[in-house]
């Protein structure tokens, strides 16, 4: 089942995806597609990177993080209801059937007429692996930082913890987005 992320119409949506490059600048190809991950590659590609750079993108889709350090999280600009659905992040680690694939569900909510301020929370008590939060303004996306050497297995485990936790539900209900990695 997919991890669910939420955004409001008119806001930027954030879909997290990370890997740890074997060495700085030793990148692996990554593709993002609209729709669940197929058997190979991505369907309906919206953005892709190769071993050096972002080499394909479509309007409104970009990488906000440092993809050279393995942050290949997707930002979708100025979302509409049509942006709802499953997105595939595929990390094409070289080798025999080594790909890591993540299906992320994006739910777009209609814009609030009167936006309520985001509640402050103490995340470190619930998730001691995580550091402090950044970006507390009501119009900003709330972001959690974490240890830089987290691996893909930890990411998957952490994603499951977050998905299954009441904290994650509370965060989603308040319109905030959790960044893993």
């Amino acid at each position: 089942s997919e991890v669910e992320y939420r955004a409001e119409v008119g806001q930027n949506a954030y879909l997290p995806c990370f890997y740890t490059p074997a060495a700085p600048g030793n990148l692996v190809p990554v593709c993002w597609g609209k729709g669940a991950c197929p058997v190979f590659e991505c369907g309906n590609v919206v953005l892709r990177t190769d071993e050096r750079d972002v080499n394909y993108w479509t309007s409104r889709y970009w990488l906000n993080g440092d993809f050279r350090k393995g942050d290949v999280s997707l930002t979708i600009e100025n979302v509409t209801l049509a942006d709802s659905g499953i997105y595939c992040c595929r990390i094409q680690i070289p080798g025999i059937m080594n790909d890591e694939k993540f299906n992320l569900k994006l739910v777009i909510k209609p814009a609030k007429v009167t936006p309520a301020p985001t509640r402050q929370r103490d995340f470190t008590a619930a998730f001691p692996r995580m550091l402090t939060t950044r970006g507390h303004g009501p119009a900003e996306t709330q972001t959690l930082g974490s240890l830089p050497d987290i691996n893909l297995t930890q990411i998957s485990t952490l994603a499951n913890e977050l998905r299954d936790s009441r904290l994650a539900n509370d965060l989603r209900d308040s319109g905030a987005t959790i960044r893993i990695g």
């Epitope: 190809p29 597609g33 729709g35 669940a36 197929p38 058997v39 190979f40 590659e41 991505c42 369907g43 309906n44 590609v45 892709r48 071993e51 394909y56 094409q92 680690i93 070289p94 080798g95 025999i96 059937m97 080594n98 790909d99």
Partner: antibody, heavy 121, light 107 residues
Framework: EVQLVESGGGLVKPGGSLRLSCAAS????????MSWVRQTPEKRLEWVAT????????YYPDSVKDRFTISRDNAKNSLYLQMNSLRAEDTAVYYC??????????????WGQGTTVTVSS | SIVMTQTPKFMSTSVGDRVSVTCKAS??????VAWYQQKPGQSPKPLIY???TRHTGVPARFTGSGSGTDFTLTISNVQSEDLAEYFC?????????FGAGTKLELK
């Protein structure tokens, strides 16, 4: 015009090895994933292997994993399938096929004419 | 492995008829289904991908539909050159798997 021409098939004894080749022309070979698909004497189609455009990633079903190896030489516009420890059930016509992927993964949009592999004692 | 159950195995038709071939996936495959046509002595030729998108040059009388687990290839106004074997394939998850085929024959 896209062309895929397979070669290297033949009769081989169980436990033997064979190397198939596929010569590609009419398109930018290094911009496509490539696959091998086989068709059994009963006319069933079976996916055998797929390789990424750079050759860095390879994919196999369990039935041939550890026995077959797909590879490519982009400088020579060539695709290969090294088949070891062959079994009677590997008897089939082997097709090489092109897989577009850049903006949307699409399986096998062009196929070669096939090369026949017979495994028998 | 996802099993693609294709029906019928054989279908008799006449020129001008409308025929449908179905494929049922044993698991959810979204719209990751392709259809291929194979004439005797030839290699398979792609007709449809993403369940309903025709490949370049494929006549409009070939229509694909379905999503999830149930898929259909419809040939309206069958022509004599359509007499062939038709295969579905799922490319949602590994291993990529094919249906057993449907042979379209003249009555």
């Amino acid at each position: 015009e896209v062309q895929l021409v397979e070669s290297g098939g033949g009769l081989v004894k169980p436990g033997g090895s064979l190397r198939l080749s596929c010569a590609a022309s009419g398109f930018t070979f290094s911009s496509y994933y490539m696959s091998w698909v086989r068709q059994t004497p009963e006319k069933r189609l079976e996916w055998v292997a797929t390789i990424s455009n750079s050759g860095g990633s390879t994919y196999y079903p369990d039935s041939v994993k550890d026995r077959f190896t797909i590879s490519r030489d982009n400088a020579k516009n060539s695709l290969y399938l090294q088949m070891n420890s062959l079994r009677a059930e590997d008897t089939a016509v082997y097709y090489c096929a092109r897989d577009p992927y850049y903006t949307n993964y699409v399986p096998m949009d062009y196929w070669g004419q096939g090369t026949t592999v017979t495994v028998s004692s | 492995s996802i099993v693609m159950t294709q029906t019928p195995k054989f279908m008799s038709t006449s020129v001008g008829d409308r025929v449908s071939v179905t494929c049922k996936a044993s698991q959810y495959v979204d719209t990751y289904v392709a259809w291929y046509q194979q004439k005797p002595g030839q290699s398979p030729k792609p007709l449809i991908y993403s369940a309903s998108t025709r490949h370049t040059g494929v006549p409009a009388r070939f229509t694909g539909s379905g999503s999830g687990t149930d898929f259909t290839l419809t040939i309206s106004n069958v022509q004599s050159e359509d007499l062939a074997e038709y295969f579905c394939a799922q490319y949602s998850s590994s291993p990529l798997t094919f249906g057993a085929g449907t042979k379209l024959e003249l009555k």
